[in-house]
Interface confidence: low
């Protein structure tokens, strides 16, 4: 492959939180800590900032196979084990064939546990690495184009996802539900809040000509639920309601 090494300014910068971020380790070494009490207070401050980060969206630079850099935003509370699934869904990769490497701003590898929230780690870059089973050079992947989609939910809330416009809503639903923190099995995708007709999950965003939609959690939203549940059942009978194929045990 003939991809240039990106200049530092080419890589998307991680969005810095409004709260004052802790000093990076390289700088704290030279901080004049006058007493043990100050040191404890400083540590407590850093921990507090890290806990604040869990409640914020973290922008990450994601390095895909083929050294292609994309930018994505994840919630700080997302555990590392979910991050792999989330990223692979976003970029059409098989999670069982990839692992994650984390790099800090200083390009040092960051060690993590599967249940560590991403916001607790000062991550600058996430590298999706193919599991090298046979030592062959991975095929460079030109990612399928993604588009920005506005998801409206809970009547007044909005969130943005970047997804493939060619993927069916059935494939996109887990990503949408993850963003809205909804249960996929009890979520309806509608054109807008006023709409009564759930969208056809076999269709893609391009098929439907949509770049904005409404996610309704039928557990929480009482507005015409019984009607919607009937529609859901009807759709389910047609075979395209369930976002996930339930295992036939």
């Amino acid at each position: 492959m003939d991809g240039r090494t990106p200049r530092p300014q080419d890589a998307p910068a991680r969005r810095k939180p409004k709260a004052k971020a802790p000093l990076p380790p390289a700088e704290t070494k030279y901080t004049d800590v006058s007493s043990a009490a100050d040191s404890v207070e400083s540590t407590a401050f850093i921990m507090e900032q890290k806990e604040n980060m869990i409640d914020k969206d973290v922008e990450l630079s994601v390095v895909l196979p083929g050294d292609i850099i994309k930018s994505t935003t994840v919630h700080g509370s997302k555990p590392m084990m979910d991050l792999l699934i989330f990223l692979c869904a976003q970029y059409h990769l098989n999670p069982s064939s990839y692992t994650i490497d984390l790099l800090s701003a200083e390009q040092n590898h960051i060690k993590f546990k599967p249940n560590t929230p991403i916001g607790m780690l000062e991550v600058e870059k996430v590298i999706l690495k193919p599991k090298m089973l046979d030592k062959k050079k991975p095929t460079p992947i030109i990612p399928e184009k993604t588009v920005r989609v506005v998801i409206n939910f809970k009547k007044t809330q909005k969130t943005i996802v970047r997804v493939s416009p060619h993927a069916s809503l059935q494939e996109l639903a887990p990503i949408i539900c993850s963003k809205c923190e909804f249960d996929p099995l009890h979520t309806l995708l509608l054109k807008d809040y006023q709409s009564q007709e759930p969208l056809d999950l076999t269709k893609s965003l391009n098929d439907l000509g949509l770049r904005e939609l409404y996610a309704m959690d039928v557990n929480r939203e009482s507005c015409q639920i019984s009607q919607n549940l009937d529609i859901m059942k009807e759709k389910e009978n047609k075979g395209f309601f369930s976002f996930f194929q339930r295992s036939k045990k």
Partner: antibody, heavy 116, light 113 residues
Framework: EVQLVESGGGLVKPGGSLKLSCAAS????????MYWVRQTPEKRLEWVAA????????YYPDSVKGRFTISRDNAKNNLYLQMSSLKSEDTAMYYC?????????WGQGTTLTVSS | DVVMTQTPLSLPVSLGDQASISCRSS???????????LHWYLQKPGQSPKLLIY???NRFSGVPDRFSGSGSGTDFTLKISRVEAEDLGVYFC??????????FGGGTKLEIK
């Protein structure tokens, strides 16, 4: 409406240089990989260069590597192909194309003739 | 590099007939992500190529349903159910599974018998 308009073609002597341009409109330019593809006088299509949507990554076939440079200006919605050390076998119609994993829109092309 | 071979080189047809163009790749075009990145383009006389079919069988927007793509692995086919005058031109297959380089077939000229 997606539009790609190439310009800059012409007659060049072997060993010479030329820069092609492609003006894009009707879509968010910075969202797409862009490509140059050429069509030889025998009507064969050959991919010549590719550039990532942000401009950080460039790709070339061995036949042009080291001689051609693809670049883009996302602020101006322009794609470029700087060609040097031109050879007679570079004679072709040059198209710019948009896409990620297929070329969904092509320009009308600009002709390069390399001859002494 | 993946070599794409198209047959026939030229395909004389009568209007209203069915036409079939074959494309064979030197290696499987099934990507590790499960997709097959095989596409078809049509270049009408005096025009630039236009996308017809992407990922084996998906018609691009505005492409009539008389065009259909099929195949898997290394063997692919483009069918035109009833040839119309506007379908005449050169058809190219192309792959983007193993990239770079992006590679094209040599083309098949659809012409009136």
């Amino acid at each position: 409406e997606v539009q790609l308009v190439e310009s800059g073609g012409g007659l060049v002597k072997p060993g010479g240089s030329l820069k092609l341009s492609c003006a894009a409109s009707g879509f968010t330019f910075s969202d797409y990989y862009m490509y140059w593809v050429r069509q030889t006088p025998e009507k064969r299509l050959e991919w010549v260069a590719a550039i990532s949507n942000g401009g950080s990554y460039t790709y070339y076939p061995d036949s042009v590597k080291g001689r051609f440079t693809i670049s883009r200006d996302n602020a101006k919605n322009n794609l470029y192909l700087q060609m040097s050390s031109l050879k007679s076998e570079d004679t072709a119609m040059y198209y710019c194309a948009r896409g990620d994993y297929y070329f969904d829109y092509w320009g009308q092309g600009t002709t390069l003739t390399v001859s002494s | 590099d993946v070599v794409m071979t198209q047959t026939p080189l030229s395909l004389p047809v009568s209007l209203g007939d069915q036409a079939s163009i074959s494309c064979r790749s030197s290696q499987s075009l099934v990507h590790s992500n499960g997709n097959t990145y095989l596409h078809w383009y049509l270049q009408k006389p005096g025009q630039s190529p236009k996308l017809l079919i992407y990922k084996v069988s998906n018609r691009f927007s505005g492409v009539p349903d008389r065009f259909s793509g099929s195949g898997s692995g290394t063997d692919f086919t483009l069918k035109i159910s009833r040839v119309e005058a506007e379908d005449l031109g050169v058809y190219f297959c192309s792959q983007s599974t193993h990239v770079p380089p992006w590679t094209f077939g040599g083309g098949t000229k659809l012409e009136i018998k």
